[in-house]
C-alpha cells in the first residue's frame, strides 16, 4: 500500500496473509473455512495466516492454517487478468474471535464514489521497494467505469473496476494482490493489477467480487 497508514492492530480481522516461506499475497476470510484471493496468487502450496498484524513477529493472535484446496476461477486469464479470483479452502476451520472474523460478500455492485478500505502488506514505495511488517490501510473511492476505462484503454473488462486517485500517490502495490477492498462492510474488490503503483492516471484495478458471488457460493457448496 502506497500512501496509506498503519492499520490499528487487528482492525481488519478478515485480512489474511498467504505465505510460501514469505508473504506473497493477501486474502479475505469469507467463512470459517474459505478465503477469497486473486487468481494470479495461485501456488500449489499455501499457508494461510490469519489474525496477523506484524507479519515478522508472533504477537499471539495468529492462526496458521494450510490450504486444503486451491481453486482458481475456471476462466482466469493470465494475459488479461480477467476473472482474477481464487478460493482457498482451509484444512481446518478458523477460530472466529475479535481478531479473526469474516467479511460479507456484496449484495450489490460497487457504486461510484463509495469510500472503501484497501489493506495489505505490500510495497509502500511507488518506486523501489519498502515492504512493511505491519498491515497498511488506505481509504480510497470507487472510480467510475468511464474513468477506469480511460486510464487503461482496452484493458478493463466488466469483471474489473478501479479504486483510487487519478492524481497518484495512493494505491495498492506488489504484495497486496488478493487482498480486500471493503466498502460499507462488504467485500467489493480483490486487489488485482495496475500500471506501476500510485502513478498519475493509473489507478489500481480490482476484481469485481459481485460478479462472482454465485460462483463462490456454488464452489463452496460443491467442496464442503
Amino acid at each position: 500500500i502506497v500512501g496509506g497508514y498503519n492499520c490499528e492492530e487487528n482492525s481488519v480481522p478478515y485480512q489474511v496473509s498467504l505465505n510460501s516461506g514469505y508473504h506473497f499475497c493477501g486474502g479475505s476470510l469469507i467463512n470459517e473455512q474459505w478465503v477469497v484471493s486473486a487468481g494470479h496468487c495461485y501456488k500449489s502450496r499455501i499457508q494461510v495466516r490469519l489474525g496477523e498484524h506484524n507479519i515478522e513477529v508472533l504477537e499471539g493472535n495468529e492462526q496458521f492454517i494450510n490450504a486444503a484446496k486451491i481453486i482458481r476461477h475456471p476462466q482466469y486469464d493470465r494475459k488479461t487478468l480477467n476473472n482474477d479470483i481464487m478460493l482457498i479452502k482451509l484444512s481446518s476451520r478458523a477460530v472466529i474471535n475479535a481478531r479473526v472474523s469474516t467479511i460479507s460478500l456484496p449484495t450489490a455492485p460497487p457504486a461510484t464514489g463509495t469510500k472503501c478500505l484497501i489493506s495489505g502488506w505490500g510495497n509502500t514505495a511507488s518506486s523501489g521497494a519498502d515492504y512493511p511488517d505491519e498491515l497498511q490501510c488506505l481509504d480510497a473511492p470507487v472510480l467510475s467505469q468511464a474513468k477506469c476505462e480511460a486510464s487503461y484503454p482496452g484493458k478493463i473488462t466488466s469483471n474489473m473496476f478501479c479504486v483510487g486517485f487519478l492524481e497518484g500517490g495512493k494505491d495498492s502495490c506488489q504484495g497486496d494482490a488478493g487482498g480486500p477492498v471493503v466498502c460499507n462492510g462488504q467485500l467489493q474488490g480483490v486487489v488485482s493489477w495496475g500500471d506501476g503503483c500510485a502513478q498519475k492516471n493509473k489507478p489500481g484495478v480490482y476484481t469485481k467480487v459481485y460478479n462472482y458471488v454465485k460462483w463462490i457460493k456454488n464452489t463452496i457448496a460443491a467442496n464442503s
Epitope: 516461506g21 486473486a38 496468487c41 493470465r78 521497494a129 502495490c173 506488489q174 504484495g175 494482490a177
Partner: antibody
C-alpha cells in the same frame, strides 16, 4: 522430480553465436520464469537476464543488451539463450535457473530454486 | 543497480565451528535476499530464500537473518560437506545482482 536439463558444451570462435537450451520437467513450465546466470572461470555469478515462460517478457542485463536473446518454446517446456558476437571473455559456464513468475500485484521475488547442470561455452580462436 | 557486498571473501574453519557470512546491499531490499551454496564444478544450490526461510531439504544448521541492507548467513556447526563457496543474491528487483562470494575452507 523438478529439473532443468541443459544442452552440451560448446566451443566457438570469436564473433560467432551460441544458443544454449534448458529443458524443464516436473512442473508447469508456464507458471515460472527462467533466469540465465553465467560464471567465468574462477569468478563469481553474473546474472544475464530473465524471461517469463508464460508471456515471453524479458529483462536483460544492461551490459549484454543487444547481444543476448532469451526465448521459450512452451510446447516442449524449453528455454533458450542465444549470445551473439562472442568474445573471449564470454567463456563461462552458463546456467538456467527457475524463479517466480511476475504477475499483477503479487510479491515479486526473484530467487532461483532450481538450477540446470550448466553448459560450458568456450570462446577461442 | 543494487550492489551486494559479501564479507569475508574467504574464511578458514574447522568441522564443528560456527561460521557467519555477511552480505550488505547498497540500498534497502526489504527481506528479498537469497543465499546459495556452490561446490566446484556444480551448479549453485538454494539454501535460504526471503532472508530467513530455509529451502526444503536444507539442513537446519543453516540459518539466515536480516532485513533492509544487512543480512547474515550462519552455519551453526560446520560439517565436512559444507566446505564450499557461498553467494548472496538480491531478489528484490531487476537487474538481479550477486555478492562476490565467500569461500569456506578447511583450516
Amino acid at each position: 522430480q523438478v529439473q532443468l536439463v541443459q544442452s552440451g558444451a560448446e566451443v566457438k570462435k570469436p564473433g560467432a553465436s551460441v544458443k544454449v537450451s534448458c529443458k524443464a520437467s516436473g512442473y508447469t513450465f508456464t507458471s515460472y520464469g527462467i533466469s540465465w546466470v553465467r560464471q567465468a572461470p574462477g569468478q563469481g555469478l553474473e546474472w544475464m537476464g530473465w524471461i517469463s515462460a508464460y508471456s515471453g517478457d524479458t529483462n536483460y542485463a544492461q551490459k549484454l543488451q543487444g547481444r543476448v536473446t532469451m526465448t521459450t518454446d512452451t510446447s516442449t517446456s524449453t528455454a533458450y539463450m542465444e549470445l551473439r558476437s562472442l568474445r573471449s571473455d564470454d567463456t563461462a559456464v552458463y546456467y538456467c535457473a527457475r524463479g517466480d513468475e511476475v504477475v499483477g500485484k503479487m510479491t515479486y521475488y526473484y530467487g532461483m530454486d532450481v538450477w540446470g547442470q550448466g553448459t560450458t561455452v568456450t570462446v577461442s580462436s | 543497480d543494487i550492489q551486494m557486498t559479501q564479507s569475508p571473501s574467504s574464511v578458514s574453519a574447522s568441522v564443528g565451528d560456527r561460521v557467519t557470512i555477511t552480505c550488505r546491499a547498497s540500498q534497502g531490499i526489504s527481506r528479498w535476499l537469497a543465499w546459495y551454496q556452490q561446490k566446484p564444478g556444480k551448479a549453485p544450490k538454494l539454501l535460504i530464500y526471503a532472508a530467513s526461510s530455509l529451502q526444503s531439504g536444507v539442513p537446519s544448521r543453516f540459518s539466515g537473518s536480516g532485513s533492509g541492507t544487512d543480512f547474515t548467513l550462519t552455519i551453526s556447526s560446520l560439517q565436512p560437506e559444507d566446505f564450499a563457496t557461498y553467494y548472496c543474491q538480491q531478489a528484490n528487483s531487476f537487474p538481479i545482482t550477486f555478492g562476490g562470494g565467500t569461500k569456506v575452507e578447511i583450516k
